[in-house]
């Protein structure tokens, strides 16, 4: 059974992940059109289901494309380099989902824009945090 200290650690990691994803989203929302329009042609895959920490596997698999689009649409909107930002997220995701069980991610048929993708994972973090508090 999860201890209060492990629950607290999970909560803090999720809050950190949430802040990183929100920072990226805020940076993107600061782009002026038509640059934002161009970024929205970059496609992301969404999880069919995202209700448990193991489903973060689906986020992990899309981190490389996320780093790519942030590099390609390079901007001064981010304080950290995309590589460092995504590396930080990757470390948190790996810790949160754990490596004991191998989970095969199932993706939805519809793809998403970067904004929809980030919003989906922000909602996921918020939802899990709310169950822990």
């Amino acid at each position: 059974a999860p201890t209060s200290s492990s629950t607290k650690k999970t909560q803090l990691q999720l809050e950190h992940l949430l802040l990183d994803l929100q920072m990226i989203l805020n940076g993107i929302n600061n782009y002026k059109n038509p640059k934002l329009t161009r970024m929205l042609t970059f496609k992301f895959y969404m999880p069919k289901k995202a209700t448990e920490l193991k489903h973060l596997q689906c986020l992990e698999e899309e981190l490389k494309p996320l780093e790519e689009v942030l590099n390609l649409a390079q901007s001064k909107n981010f304080h950290l380099r995309p590589r460092d930002l995504i590396s930080n997220i990757n470390v948190i995701v790996l810790e949160l989902k754990g490596s004991e069980t191998t989970f095969m991610c199932e993706y939805a048929d519809e793809t998403a824009t970067i904004v929809e993708f980030l919003n989906r994972w922000i909602t996921f973090c918020q939802s899990i945090i709310s169950t822990l508090t």
Partner: antibody, heavy 121, light 113 residues
Framework: EVQLVQSGAEVKKPGESLKISCKGS????????IGWVRQMPGKGLEWMGI????????RYSPSFQGQVTISADKSISTAYLQWSSLKASDTAMYYC??????????????WGQGTTVTVSS | DIVMTQTPLSLPVTPGEPASISCRST????????????LDWYLQKPGQSPQLLIY???YRASGVPDRFSGSGSGTDFTLKISRVEAEDVGVYYC?????????FGGGTKVEIK
């Protein structure tokens, strides 16, 4: 090896329909846009439009909108270009090319060998 | 649509000598205030499919020799070949991908003198 293999040459009469294909292999076909480019005899390259096979999102150049249909079958990693009623002016070489996860942020890095379409009565 | 204009139409070259092709766009190809320049160069060798040479203004595509280089800014761009080789003959095209629809230049035919 990453490649796009196109269907063979076609000779058609005006008014006939036609569907040519472009099969991808060696990469995740559903995660990259596939564009179509026309080259009329002795002329330059014209960008016709593009499809994302993962969700069949399709965009057409205004010059080709309503003239052709671009589609894809992700289960067999194949993109298509089709005409419902060919004209003599459709005579050209047609190329498919891969264009990454965003056609604004990637060049066309892999090309098919081209399909020659001849329309003559 | 963004119109891409290439000069010259034809370029006779001597092997071992440098060569230069120009491309001009009707508007800046810079992706935002601090972004990349969304311009590519392609080469179509006789009887072959086009191939990507240079992407995003100045990055050489995989396997492209370092004698090819791309430069420029805003609306004026240049493809340089430092020392032309016989295998470099063909038609060179610039292409913008800043705005939809993507558009190619008319092409520059490079041939050996």
């Amino acid at each position: 090896e990453v490649q796009l293999v196109q269907s063979g040459a076609e000779v058609k009469k005006p008014g006939e329909s036609l569907k040519i294909s472009c099969k991808g292999s060696g990469y995740s076909f559903t995660s990259q846009w596939i564009g179509w480019v026309r080259q009329m005899p002795g002329k330059g390259l014209e960008w016709m439009g593009i499809i994302f096979p993962g969700d069949s999102d399709t965009r057409y150049s205004p010059s080709f909108q309503g003239q052709v249909t671009i589609s894809a079958d992700k289960s067999i990693s194949t993109a298509y270009l089709q005409w419902s009623s060919l004209k003599a002016s459709d005579t050209a070489m047609y190329y498919c090319a891969r264009q990454g996860r965003s056609y604004h942020y990637y060049g066309m890095d892999v090309w098919g060998q081209g399909t020659t379409v001849t329309v003559s009565s | 649509d963004i119109v891409m204009t290439q000069t010259p139409l034809s370029l006779p070259v001597t092997p071992g000598e440098p060569a230069s092709i120009s491309c001009r766009s009707t508007q800046s190809l810079l992706d935002g205030d601090d972004g990349n320049t969304l311009l590519d160069w392609y080469l179509q060798k006789p009887g072959q499919s086009p191939q990507l040479l240079i992407y995003t203004l100045s990055y050489r595509a995989s396997g492209v020799p370092d004698r090819f280089s791309g430069s420029g800014s805003g609306t004026d761009f240049t493809l340089k070949i430092s020392r032309v080789e016989a295998e470099d003959v063909g038609v060179y095209y610039c292409m913008q991908r800043l705005e939809f629809p993507l558009t190619f230049g008319g092409g520059t035919k490079v041939e050996i003198k």
